[in-house]
């Protein structure tokens, strides 16, 4: 009779996390008599998965009735697969021996790869705001996926970005993987309403990619433009001067009026007008009593925006 | 080299409807060269499931790359399994020939059984009502399940019944099965609120049986008991006689008073009193003017309940 062969027909099996994995194994002969065992891995550190003879293996069921005398099928099913179950599984025939059974022949092994979905991508932006024309970095992270192959793209308002760098870790074999990508985005004044999107495609997602988003409103500071103008006189001896603060973001803004360098009034912007692009406008006015001045007066509108260094605009009021 | 063997390790595979079925097949040798095919069934009428050489098989995917020169694994996966896919699948090796390839060797076959859930059980009762102490039949039907093994139990108010007969059709092999069970239930006067339950356990239900119910209120008729009594006189020359109609079900009831066999009044029961057991009570009274009678009067309370033959109770009123 031909010597027993251990047939593991599948070189590899791929299973989605949470499903059951069936690992096929067949013998070509009933002899020599002795049990079979399934191991994950080879060599001294191999892990026992199933022992026909003894032990409790709650996640393992046999496809056939292994107690039947003429059984040649030693396929098993492992329930509730997780990425930690990935590896090469060997069906090993033992012959009876004493004091212990003796390993007789091993199958070629079946590599079990576990398809695990990536976690929802988390996109984070810069710690401090930057102004238009500057470049800021966004990162996108996701974990726990398998296999390693994954595609990541960046978009800004639907337009694909090209300036990014992606790493998948670890570089070698692992039960699951993580991805980390950094995209560099050049800010423009109109970016308050803009959004960056990190999009990931993976075999487990069946063509329905995962997306993580971040709003550029968290990353951008648009400094205001100032314009000081004199309005028509409301009354004799009274000048009305306005400071138009335009196109700033975010909201936080403090304005100080100075008359010839001396602080006249300080106020915090409250009722703002929002522009279509998401920036804000605000106007402040100062009534100057010209009776109190013999000479010309220099009025200065000084604005501190979002904790930055103050900017100012002056206006020379002629006393006629 | 040993002659090629076709190894189908699993004698049987069981798959839930809607899932994919993996059918394992391995060759022990690369020669003779030639394609493999998968068939369902054997003999002249066998059905081609997959042909490695040619054809379009949208539901079939191969586990391995069959185009690789040294491939010995010819396992396939069939998607979206339905009960109609049940059967024995054979992996068949052909050797190249002219004009046609020649069948060389077949695997032993893998029987694919499809686990399909039974439909929700429908319980129906008798077409006509029956009275207590009589036996009525209830039927329970369910369809579309597989495998054939199924357990059906009957309960009345939580107590298991033993007098029933169950058939699973067809008797022979089939892609799916139907069950029909008839239970015989002895009615009691207190059964208006009773319920019969048909409970089915099947491997696909994971220990959570399906139940169908029917209310015995649809099947039972509890005939009334009648009691005619004379009440104390309200006024001289006037006798008050009541007819107490007790413990009947269903509601429909018509009562006729007769004086010495002549119809005095007919009325339909409306405002009923419901008892705890679901039956109803009703009372009717008749005022008899004794001046109009010289001799004794026989008063009869005649009740027609639920379209059945009338029952009556008489009372002799003495004219003093």
């Amino acid at each position: 009779e031909d010597e027993l062969q251990v047939i593991q027909p599948e070189k590899s099996v791929s299973v989605a996390a949470g499903e059951s994995a069936t690992l096929c194994c067949a013998m070509t002969s009933l002899i020599p008599v002795g049990p079979i065992m399934w191991f994950r891995g080879a060599g001294a550190g191999r892990e026992l998965i199933y022992n026909q003879k003894e032990g409790h293996f709650p996640r393992v069921t046999t496809v056939s009735e292994l107690t039947k005398r003429n059984n040649l099928d030693f396929s098993i099913s492992i329930s509730n697969i997780t990425p930690a179950d990935a590896g090469t599984y060997y069906c090993v025939k033992f012959r009876k021996g004493s004091p212990d059974d003796v390993e007789f022949k091993s199958g070629a092994g079946t590599e079990l790869s576990v398809r695990a979905k990536p976690s929802a991508p988390v996109v984070s932006g810069p710690a401090v705001r930057a102004t238009p024309e500057h470049t800021v970095s966004f990162t996108c992270e996701s974990h726990g996926f398998s296999p390693r192959d994954i595609t990541l793209k960046w978009f800004k308002n639907g337009n694909e970005l090209s300036d990014f760098q992606t790493n998948v870790d670890p570089a070698g074999d692992s039960v699951s993987y993580s991805i980390h990508s950094t995209a560099r985005v050049v800010l423009t004044r109109g970016d308050v309403h803009s959004q960056v999107i990190c999009e990931m495609a993976h075999i487990t997602l069946q063509g329905d990619p995962l997306r993580g988003t971040a709003n550029l409103s968290e990353a951008i500071r648009v400094p205001p433009t100032l314009e000081v103008t004199q309005q028509p006189m409301r009354a004799e001896n009274q000048a009305n001067v306005t400071c138009q603060v335009s196109n700033f973001y975010p909201r936080g803004l403090q304005l100080t009026w100075l008359e010839n360098g001396n602080v006249s009034r300080t106020e915090t912007a409250s009722t703002l007008i929002e522009n279509k692009d998401g920036t804000y406008n605000w106007m402040s006015w100062l009534l100057v009593n010209t009776c109190a001045h013999r000479d010309d007066v220099v009025l200065t509108c000084q604005v501190e925006h979002d904790g930055q260094q103050a900017v100012s605009k002056s206006y020379a009021l002629e006393i006629s | 080299e040993d002659e090629l063997q076709v190894i189908q390790p699993e004698k049987s595979v069981s798959v839930a409807a809607g899932e994919s079925a993996t059918l394992c097949c391995a060759m022990t040798s690369l020669i003779p060269v030639g394609p493999i095919m998968w068939f369902r069934g054997a003999g002249a009428g066998r059905e081609l499931i997959y042909n490695q050489k040619e054809g379009h098989f949208p539901r079939v995917t191969t586990v391995s790359e069959l185009t690789k020169r040294n491939n010995l694994d010819f396992s396939i996966s069939i998607s979206n399994i339905t009960p109609a896919d049940a059967g024995t699948y054979y992996c068949v090796k052909f050797r190249k020939g002219s004009p046609d390839d020649v069948e060389f060797k077949s695997g032993a076959g893998t029987e694919l059984s499809v686990r399909a859930k039974p439909s929700a059980p429908v319980v129906s009762g008798p077409a006509v009502r029956a009275t207590p102490e009589h036996t009525v039949s209830f039927t329970c039907e369910s369809h579309g399940f597989s495998p054939r093994d199924i357990t059906l139990k009957w309960f009345k108010n939580g107590n298991e019944l033993s007098d029933f007969q169950t058939n699973v059709d067809p008797a022979g092999d089939s892609v799916s099965y139907s069950i029909h069970s008839t239970a015989r239930v002895v009615l009691t006067r207190g059964d208006v609120h009773s319920q019969v339950i048909c409970e089915m356990a099947h491997i696909t239900l994971q220990g959570d049986p399906l139940r169908g119910t029917a209310n015995l209120s649809e099947a039972i008729r509890v005939p009334p008991t009648l009691e005619v009594t004379q009440q104390p006189m309200r006024a001289e020359n006037q006798a008050n006689v009541t007819c107490q109609v007790s413990n009947f079900y269903p509601r429909g009831l018509q009562l006729t008073w007769l004086e010495n066999g002549n119809v005095s009044r007919t009325e339909t029961a409306s405002t009923l009193i419901e008892n705890k057991d679901g039956t109803y009570n009703w009372m009717s009274w008749l005022l008899v003017n004794t001046c109009a009678h010289r001799d004794d009067v026989v008063l009869t309370c005649q009740v027609e309940h639920d379209g059945q033959q009338a029952v009556s109770k008489s009372y002799a009123l003495e004219i003093s």
């Epitope: 009779e1 002969s29 009933l30 002899i31 020599p32 008599v33 002795g34 049990p35 079979i36 026909q52 003879k53 003894e54 292994l66 107690t67 005398r69 059984n71 012959r95 009876k96 021996g97 004493s98 003796v102 | -």
Partner: antibody, heavy 120, light 107 residues
């Protein structure tokens, strides 16, 4: 056909040795183990030991350790059981049995038995 | 060593009777139990292996059940040729041990 043929009855004196043979035919001898089981007159079955016909490993019952030796000759598909220092309570029918379980031990094929009588 | 206790030691029954023999192991042996039939002057014959599997060629009136420590051999309808002694045997580990036997006699 598949069978185990044992050697004939033996009469031995106390202190002597006996060697019983068991020839297998009709199956691959090396694929199975052989156990030896004895049965004293009117008594039950007593397992004596086991030998692998493939690798020659043995396992003996504790009470017979040192007195019993089991061997095989794969060229003739024969198993042997030698029992030394015989005593009168060794009088029994000695059976060889093919052990056929894969992960357990049971005996699906038996020889007809060899009667060994120990008497002075 | 694993002790095997068989009961009853003998049973008297008639043709057509249902006969049940029990066997208890002193420790758990999974399903690794066999049942044998022995007639006078003959070698034992394997009836049941792995607690419940019918050996090829054995009539279906013989059946086995149990796992762990308690096992049963049932003869559903006793036939004339079934009058014999029955032994259980644990095959879980060395040393292999047999029960004391149950003699099924004609009533």
């Amino acid at each position: 056909q598949v069978q185990l043929v044992q050697s004939g009855a033996e009469v031995k004196k106390p202190g002597a040795s006996v060697k019983v043979s068991c020839k297998a035919s009709g199956y691959t001898f090396g694929g199975y183990g052989i156990s030896w089981v004895r049965q004293a007159p009117g008594q039950g079955l007593e397992w004596m030991g086991w030998i692998s016909a493939y690798g020659g490993e043995t396992n003996y019952a504790q009470k017979l350790q040192g007195r019993v030796t089991m061997t095989t000759d794969t060229s003739t598909s024969t198993a042997y059981m030698e029992l030394r220092s015989l005593r009168s309570d060794d009088t029994a029918v000695y059976y060889c049995a093919r052990e056929a379980g894969s992960s357990w031990y049971d005996f699906d094929l038996w020889g007809r038995g060899t009667l060994v009588t120990v008497s002075s | 060593d694993i002790q095997m206790t068989q009961s009853p030691s003998s049973v008297s029954a008639s043709v057509g009777d249902r006969v049940t023999i029990t066997c208890r192991a002193s420790q758990g042996i999974s399903s690794w139990l066999a049942w044998y039939q022995q007639k006078p002057g003959k070698a034992p014959k394997l009836l049941i292996y792995a607690a419940s599997n019918l050996q090829s060629g054995v009539p279906s009136r013989f059946s086995g059940s149990g796992s762990g420590t308690d096992f049963t051999l049932t003869i559903s309808s006793l036939q004339p040729e079934d009058f014999a002694t029955y032994y259980c045997q644990q095959g879980a580990s060395f040393p292999i041990t047999f029960g004391g036997g149950t003699k099924v006699e004609i009533k």
